[in-house]
């Protein structure tokens, strides 16, 4: 899977959208590596 910063950001946005935003506060692009997905 793509692990550039932009890919990570878009994947996280999709995850947040699907979860209704119910995730940990530190679950942000600059804290999350591609392996988190």
């Amino acid at each position: 899977a793509c692990d550039t910063a932009t890919c990570v950001t878009h994947r996280l946005a999709g995850l947040l959208s699907r979860s209704g935003g119910v995730v940990k506060n530190n679950f942000v692009p600059t804290n999350v590596g591609s392996k988190a997905f």
Epitope: T4, T9, H10, A13, V28, T30, N31
Partner: antibody, heavy 119, light 107 residues
Framework: EVQLVQSGAEVKKPGASVKVSCKAS????????MNWVRQAPGQCLEWIGD????????NYNQKFKGRATLTVDKSASTAYMELSSLRSEDTAVYYC????????????WGQGTTVTVSS | DIQMTQSPSSLSASVGDRVTITCKAS??????VAWFQQKPGKAPKSLIY???YRYSGVPSRFSGSGSGTDFTLTISSLQPEDFATYYC?????????FGCGTKVEIK
């Protein structure tokens, strides 16, 4: 309201360095990567690199590696792009840009900083 | 580096026309492509990410499609404010690379 506000236009001599700033507001600066892109007159857009403001990690376009340096001042929510050993071909508009998720999912760009390299 | 080849480099169209711009990547970039609109003297404005998703606030007349190496931006009914230059970008691999633009002019 998310804003990326860049420093003003610069005129530099060949061989000099320039440091462009990008002040972020309206979101948590350390949560999102900051990109730097440039556009020379009549040329394509060129990606310079990105920086993780949280940890300071960087990715550079090899074309600029060794000449471009990306840094941040977390306390001031400001990103910087320094370009050294300037040549006339570096005359361009330099942009910072960041894809933000909260408060609004969008790809925000600064207004651009014109850097002119001329003897 | 991945080359992004846009075509045409310019086109003339009238208000109400359907406009299609294509972008070809030199290697597979999955759907990791964005499209931007730029007007003279202004910063680029983001329209599309992940090949086909519109950012909030982008009019529905703009749509993107494609995957792998071939991508398309379509404007279903051109409006006066749409006359601008459009760029594609891949962000699947570092360094990110852009197409050299398609200028949409008034016929």
């Amino acid at each position: 309201e998310v804003q990326l506000v860049q420093s003003g236009a610069e005129v530099k001599k060949p061989g000099a360095s320039v440091k462009v700033s990008c002040k972020a507001s309206g979101y948590t600066f350390t949560d999102y990567y900051m990109n730097w892109v440039r556009q020379a007159p009549g040329q394509c857009l060129e990606w310079i690199g990105d920086i993780n403001p949280n940890q300071g990690g960087t990715n550079y376009n090899q074309k600029f590696k060794g000449r471009a340096t990306l840094t941040v001042d977390k306390s001031a929510s400001t990103a910087y792009m320094e370009l050294s050993s300037l040549r006339s071909e570096d005359t361009a508009v330099y942009y910072c840009a960041s894809i933000i998720i909260v408060p609004n999912y969008f790809d925000y760009w600064g207004q651009g900083t014109t850097v002119t390299v001329s003897s | 580096d991945i080359q992004m080849t846009q075509s045409p480099s310019s086109l003339s169209a009238s208000v109400g026309d359907r406009v299609t711009i294509t972008c070809k990547a030199s290697q597979n970039v999955d759907t990791n492509v964005a499209w931007f609109q730029q007007k003279p003297g202004k910063a680029p404005k983001s329209l599309i990410y992940s090949a086909s998703y519109r950012y909030s606030g982008v009019p529905s007349r703009f749509s993107g499609s494609g995957s792998g190496t071939d991508f398309t931006l379509t404007i279903s009914s051109l409006q006066p404010e749409d006359f601008a230059t459009y760029y594609c970008q891949q962000y699947n691999n570092y360094p990110y690379t852009f197409g050299c633009g398609t200028k949409v002019e008034i016929k």
